[in-house]
């Protein structure tokens, strides 16, 4: 089971109109540049076999991957939104740094790995897609971690 007290984000993180708006604007800008509409990274399949109590830990993995492998390499794109949204998401990641689960997390890693593989397979267009789904990342973090 998760060390649940650490797998928590305060509701206030998701109630800041300015940065929320910038996050959604960034997602919209990127989705306009995404021409691969057949693929969805964040959706029901990501959570397959993952209990409600484990979902924040799963989303922490997705958030960290998105920051390290997508947003940092693409940090010069989609300005001015990117320069504001990346530090916000990095703060959320930092607040989840002590979120772990005890025991086997192989089922979670398997689901996250599929997302990573899809992004890598698609190359730069996979990174654009991941940025275009930041609204879904935001909502999934909110639902899983508050």
């Amino acid at each position: 089971a998760p060390i649940s007290s650490h797998c928590r984000l305060d509701k206030s993180n998701f109630q800041q109109p300015y940065i929320t708006n910038r996050t959604f604007m960034l997602a919209k800008e990127a989705s306009l540049a995404d021409n691969n509409t057949d693929v969805r990274l964040i959706g029901e399949k990501l959570f397959h076999g993952v209990s409600m109590s484990e979902r924040c830990y799963l989303m922490k993995q997705v958030l960290n991957f998105t920051l390290e492998e997508v947003l940092f390499p693409q940090s010069d794109r989609f300005q001015p939104y990117m320069q504001e949204v990346v530090p916000f998401l990095a703060r959320l990641s930092n607040r989840l740094s002590t979120c772990h689960i005890e025991g086997d997390d192989l089922h979670i890693q398997r689901n996250v790995q599929k997302l990573k593989d899809t992004v890598k397979k698609l190359g730069e267009s996979g990174e654009i897609k991941a940025i275009g789904e930041l609204d879904l990342l935001f909502m999934s973090l909110r639902n899983a971690c508050i």
């Epitope: 109109p17 919209k28 969805r40 029901e44 879904l136």
Partner: antibody, heavy 119, light 107 residues
Framework: QVQLVESGGGLVKPGGSLRLSCAAS????????MSWIRQAPGKGLEWVSA????????YYADSVKGRITISRDNAKNSLYLQMNSLRAEDTAVYYC????????????WGRGTLVTVSS | DIQMTQSPSTLSASVGDRVTITCRAS??????LAWYQQKPGKAPKLLIY???SLASGVPSRFSGSGSGTEFTLTISSLQPDDFATYYC?????????FGGGTKVEIK
Amino acid sequence: QVQLVESGGGLVKPGGSLRLSCAASGFTFSDYYMSWIRQAPGKGLEWVSAISGSGGSTYYADSVKGRITISRDNAKNSLYLQMNSLRAEDTAVYYCARGLWVWDPLDYWGRGTLVTVSS
Amino acid sequence: DIQMTQSPSTLSASVGDRVTITCRASEGIYHWLAWYQQKPGKAPKLLIYKASSLASGVPSRFSGSGSGTEFTLTISSLQPDDFATYYCQQYSNYPLTFGGGTKVEIK
């Protein structure tokens, strides 16, 4: 092309039961959340129920909780709505519609099936 | 539950008019708002999703804007085919909820 075809509507007495079906084609059915929405004669749209692609999560409007059960058979590309203890206020056209996930709109709708609850 | 309030309930307009319909949510729904068009005896048709994104095959005279609690649907130049009833719908949270509808009729 995407097609959703509802069936099973008809005239039923108050307190009676009915099972609606929605046959889906033209897309990977198991990938989509499915919803039932109803519209009373001359009135607006009211969402009734939804089910996740796997069938593992279900959602209901308060007005129908305990009386209605949503289910799906992904092998048959079919969605169902079991309606029990029917009331006059359940009289409506019932539409099935698809949405890819939780935060997706209802992008395709069926033509609807009319349920009339009357003695 | 999130309440969706649409105004006006009826709107009389002429071909070529610019038409604006407003939808207000009882709490913030980010951009998770859709607009649908319905003609008598027909199923609703998706026009706009994510508050401002145009659904496939929808003419560019339709546009949506807003976020949080205030949203608008605009038809830049009303066409004969646009006389119908329009509904907003939030999909931020279950239960999904619709506005009461706006009937656009010929003046």
